[in-house]
């Protein structure tokens, strides 16, 4: 048993039929010694008396909020949560496996630049009785500080008949140098509690591997005289690291017809302009990627040819 | 994805082209190592990230762009020099700061070159003949070192008398390639910055 936060404890249980469970001793937080009784949740059934209560925790029926009372007055509470381990594997019932980039990916993280700021998100089909807390550090043996905000519900999506809820959190490395070469990964730990069930999820990554620039901005077309060609120009996104001559981007310019089946013309360039042929009803899209370290491409920025 | 090959203008900062070739060569070599050594721990997640230049050179700090010198987190490790202007020891007189940056890059290349050559000698003795270092990568390191135009003592190639442990050598190769790729990215950023200065 260990303390998750004040008055909230996690009991780790091997989960199999007829498992012996864990013996837990609860102590009433009071100077009183006599006349103390214990109850569980809203039930008025007295479970025991005395300053300590010993219970055998085997299943969810044994978890919940234990309260010690004296003469009708509440003295203290202890909330017991269960963390299930089946066949040596901790349960992952609360979050949805996003399966990208590989199976058993519950947390996904992205950074718009090298400032040490990043966003992580996760999915669940659970809508209520759900709390998350997020901690992060650089490295694990001698951890350096990363500060994370509160996890918030960032999107709701309908998937077939069911709703999916996306939660996200923003974190910032306390002292990040954008030019640094990372040798220790960022560790992100998410504690998830659904009713009386506790689970934890972790992700480990280098900022350089989760970079995804914002799309290029101010995408403009300038027709070239007496030609079907246009000059496409754009700018680095505002959120990208500076100086741009050090943190350079490379770009992909795509001309796409109305129909998805039409052949796409693609040009790669390190410049912030390109000359392409603009077909009728087509659109021109540009996306960006770190020029020197091939992490993710940005989303497309698009303009219609007309 | 292959980076587009830049054809440098004659007056262009001479090292940029070489640094781009270096990054391309090390990225290709790393990809080849990952594929060939698929049953070895060779991915970024699996390996220990070691830097053989640690405490010997200070490339990141010495080559820090002027704009980042206001960032205290970039200056915390040691007294830092930063690059201001200049070209790759071309005709103009290069500033002291600049020289420090470029000589640090040169020292990195020299250390990696020695490590890679030593390792290649071991890999050539492997009866499995599973993987060797790409001669192109070694050549590109050499070209960039020549373009940097520093004269420094040649480091003798390490020779080892004991029987090589080929498993450990291959894992060390992965560690080295990952670290060298990261350093090659930094070198490319620096050259790009200098080219724009």
């Amino acid at each position: 048993i260990w303390e998750l936060k004040k008055d909230v404890y996690v009991v780790e249980l091997d989960w199999y039929p007829d498992a012996p469970g864990e013996m837990v001793v609860l102590t009433c937080d009071t100077p009183e010694e006599d006349g103390i009784t214990w109850t569980l949740d809203q039930s008025s059934e007295v479970l025991g008396s005395g300053k300590t209560l010993t219970i055998q925790v085997k299943e969810f029926g044994d978890a919940g909020q234990y309260t010690c009372h004296k003469g009708g007055e509440v003295l203290s509470h202890s909330l017991l949560l269960l963390h299930k381990k089946e066949d040596g594997i901790w349960s992952t019932d609360i979050l949805k496996d996003q399966k990208e980039p590989k199976n058993k990916t519950f947390l996904r993280c992205e950074a718009k630049n090298y400032s040490g700021r990043f966003t992580c998100w996760w999915l669940t089909t659970i809508s209520t009785d759900l709390t998350f807390s997020v901690k992060s550090s650089r490295g694990s043996s001698d951890p350096q500080g990363v500060t994370c905000g509160a996890a918030t519900l960032s999107a709701e999506r309908v998937r077939g008949d069911n709703k999916e809820y996306e939660y996200s959190v923003e974190c910032q490395e306390d002292s990040a140098c954008p030019a640094a070469e990372e040798s220790l990964p960022i560790e992100v730990m998410v504690d998830a509690v659904h009713k009386l069930k506790y689970e934890n999820y972790t992700s480990s990554f280098f900022i350089r591997d989760i970079i995804k620039p914002d799309p290029p901005k101010n995408l403009q077309l300038k027709p070239l005289k007496n030609s079907r060609q246009v000059e496409v120009s754009w700018e680095y996104p505002d959120t990208w690291s500076t100086p741009h001559s050090y943190f350079s981007l490379t770009f992909c310019v795509q001309v796409q017809g109305k129909s998805k089946r039409e052949k796409k013309d693609r040009v790669f360039t390190d410049k912030t302009s390109a000359t392409v042929i603009c077909r009728k009803n087509a659109s021109i899209s540009v996306r960006a990627q770190d020029r020197y370290y091939s992490s993710s491409w940005s989303e497309w920025a698009s303009v219609p040819c007309s | 994805r292959n980076l587009p090959v830049a054809t440098p203008d004659p007056g262009m900062f001479p090292c940029l082209h070489h640094s781009q070739n270096l990054l391309r060569a090390v990225s290709n070599m790393l990809q080849k190592a990952r594929q060939t050594l698929e049953f070895y721990p060779c991915t970024s997640e699996e390996i220990d990230h070691e830097d053989i230049t640690k405490d010997k050179t200070s490339t990141v700090e010495a080559c820090l762009p002027l704009e980042l010198t206001k960032n205290e987190s970039c200056l915390n490790s040691r007294e830092t020099s930063f690059i201001t202007n200049g070209s790759c020891l071309a005709s103009r007189k290069t500033s002291f700061m600049m020289a420090l940056c470029l000589s640090s890059i040169y020292e990195d290349l020299k250390m990696y070159q020695v490590e890679f050559k030593t390792m290649n000698a071991k890999l050539l003795m492997d009866p499995k003949r599973q993987i060797f270092l790409d001669q192109n990568m070694l050549a590109v390191i050499d070209e960039l070192m020549q373009a940097l135009n520093f004269n420094s003592e040649t480091v003798p190639q390490k020779s080892s008398l004991e029987e090589p442990d080929f498993y450990k050598t291959k894992i060390k190769l992965c560690i080295l390639l990952h670290a060298f790729r990261i350093r090659a990215v930094t070198i490319d950023r620096v050259m790009s910055y200098l080219n724009a200065s």
Epitope: Q42, E59, A63, G64, T125, I126, K163, L196, K197 | -
Partner: antibody, heavy 117, light 107 residues
Framework: QVQLQQSGAELMKPGASVKISCKAT????????IEWVKQRPGHGLEWIGD????????NYNEKFKDKATFTADTSFNTAYMQLSSLTSEDSAVYYC??????????WGQGTTLTVSS | SIVMTQTPKFLLVSAGDRVTITCKAS??????VAWYQQKSGQSPKLLIY???NRYTGVPDRFTGSGYGTDFTFTISTVQPEDLAVYFC?????????FGSGTKLEIK
Amino acid sequence: QVQLQQSGAELMKPGASVKISCKATGYTFSSYWIEWVKQRPGHGLEWIGDILPGSGSTNYNEKFKDKATFTADTSFNTAYMQLSSLTSEDSAVYYCATRRFRGLDYWGQGTTLTVSS
Amino acid sequence: SIVMTQTPKFLLVSAGDRVTITCKASQSVSNDVAWYQQKSGQSPKLLIYYASNRYTGVPDRFTGSGYGTDFTFTISTVQPEDLAVYFCQQDYTSPFTFGSGTKLEIK
């Protein structure tokens, strides 16, 4: 002893609104969700939604989003459900119940609503 | 929303019989399933929570099992006082949904 006491039966005209109350005793009212459930003969039990009195946080079943409004008064340990624009479809028994971790563990006795012109 | 398909709708049994009711969720609800008993003219009463845990004071002839999508409620030896309608419910995610109910009648 936990108890939920609901307001009495109501006979309402179509188009009108009604407010059903649920007074809780015997536990910390602010810490437990109050659930509202509808039961019509032949339609089984339908969850309308819930309110956490301490924070005022609510969840509504999409189906009842424009029909029901939940409020709670922690000084009187009472939760309320207002049903608006009543039609004959709203004629049913409405229950309040408490929920923390173990399903709907305590139920009120039910309030019968009849909507008839 | 999650559909809880409860079978059978009716059960005609004799005292002492063993009774099994099943509930199938349209998607995984982990173990967040409760079973209720509703006697004629009364409010529902909680019998089982977290799929297999008996609520305080519930006789041990009532048991529940299951995980994910398939759940079972069993009365090992039916007593005359068990005449009632039994409902399953998922409280995994909102909207919380109930099964259609199983009416237990004693011969």
